[in-house]
Interface confidence: medium
């Protein structure tokens, strides 16, 4: 692997755990200010595979609040505005890394926690067996 | 708001950063393990707003290994399977937390980044600007 | 969870403004999108206007476009509702809701799941 030459100002690590636990500062920087300026909110609803976004709160989790997305039909929106169920609407799943409060209500230690989320929908040719 | 009573368990929070830097366990807790086992991976070339994936290293970041979808073409596939530009090819966006080594090169010092990441692609309805 | 608590309302010759203030309490004010409905005697809730969770996007309804102005305050937790040039046909109890899902529409109703207690708002002629 890539081998980083160790920052002589690191912080000191003679914790008994270390390197499973590390200290993180929650200060957020915002990679994102760059970003292309043009709102993806509508897609939901423009998109053939439209979906509806539900709000997940968990006091125990950092963040607290995430939207997941439930596609709206089985098939996918043609051209008249009709559902064609010869095409499929599925999800779009992310593996997303969150903090978990461990031990719990704890206000200053967490744990690392990788759960899975639907960001959206797209529409899939589906794949159809053919039975002999 | 919601006040979570304290865990007297905690861990001590005397640092003079406290409660801007807290302590995270590394040792991921995966939360997937119950989840439809049907891969999504395929999904980016079944899709009519199909999508090519790109690797994004950075040894600074946790996790060091990002994957970042860029669509296809600017149109949709149809059903011939021709490029259809009435409609709309673009990306699902989410943003994520990451873990940003702060200061650069330590092992065990970190700070959260928000990153915006594509993760697929959606086919949308064009929105058309009628000029008058 | 969120809870809401409108201010703002009372009685107005027509032609004139109020501002109403929706507080909320709970930590995570800035993650519902939200909104205004309204309700005359006798009459169905009825949207009003709905803003987005960061403040840079709005809808309204046609009747109040041009005349109303939803904004909100994300550090004082507090959606507002500016209305101007109001009329007699405004006068209701004036809710703000917060939002839990999307269904398409911000004037859904169904999407909305906390609810204040509502402001009277009367505009006599």
């Known amino acids: 692997g890539i081998t980083i030459p160790r920052n002589p100002g690191c912080p000191n690590s003679e914790d008994k755990n270390f390197p499973r636990t590390v200290m993180v500062n929650l200060n957020i920087h915002n990679r994102n200010t760059n970003t292309n300026p043009k709102r993806s909110s509508d897609y939901y609803n423009r998109s053939t595979s439209p979906w509806n976004l539900h709000r997940n709160e968990d006091p125990e989790r950092y963040p607290s609040v995430i939207w997941e997305a439930k596609c709206r039909h089985l098939g996918c929106i043609n051209a008249d505005g009709n559902v064609d169920y010869h095409m499929n609407s599925v999800p779009i799943q992310q593996e997303i890394l969150v903090l978990r409060r461990e031990p719990p209500h704890c206000p200053n230690s967490f744990r690392l926690e990788k759960i899975l989320v639907s960001v959206g929908c797209t529409c899939v040719t589906p794949i159809v067996h053919h039975v002999a | 708001g919601i006040t979570i009573p304290r865990n007297p368990g905690c861990p001590n929070s005397e640092d003079k950063n406290f409660p801007r830097t807290v302590m995270v366990n590394l040792n991921i807790h995966n939360r997937n393990t119950n989840t439809n086992p049907k891969r999504s991976s395929d999904y980016y070339n079944r899709s009519t707003s199909p999508w090519n994936l790109h690797r994004n290293e950075d040894p600074e970041r946790y996790p060091s290994v990002i994957w970042e979808a860029k669509c296809r073409h600017l149109g949709c596939i149809n059903a011939d399977g021709n490029v259809d530009y009435h409609m709309n090819s673009v990306p699902i966006q989410q943003e994520i937390l990451v873990l940003r080594r702060e200061p650069p090169h330590c092992p065990n010092s970190f700070r959260l980044e928000k990153i915006l990441v594509s993760v697929g692609c959606t086919c949308v309805t064009p929105i058309v600007h009628h000029v008058a | 969870e969120v809870q809401l608590v409108e201010s703002g309302g009372g009685l107005v010759q027509a032609g004139g403004s109020l501002r109403l203030s929706c507080a909320a309490s709970?930590?995570?004010?800035?993650?519902?999108?939200m909104g205004w409905f309204r309700q005359a005697p006798g009459k169905e809730r009825e949207f009003v206007a709905a803003?987005?969770?960061?403040?840079?996007?709005?809808a309204y309804r046609d009747f109040v476009k041009g005349r109303f102005t939803i904004s909100r305050d994300n550090a004082r937790d507090t959606v507002y509702l500016h209305m101007t040039s109001l009329k007699p046909e405004d006068t209701a109890i004036y809710y703000c809701?917060?939002?839990?899902?999307?269904?398409?529409?911000?004037?859904?109703?169904?999407?909305?799941?906390?609810w204040g207690q509502g402001t009277q708002v009367t505009v006599s002629s």
């Open positions: 803003i987005s969770m960061s403040g840079d996007d709005s």
């Open positions: 709970g930590r995570t004010f800035f993650s519902y999108p």
């Open positions: 809701a917060a939002r839990t899902s999307y269904n398409g529409r911000y004037d859904y109703i169904d999407d909305y799941s906390y």
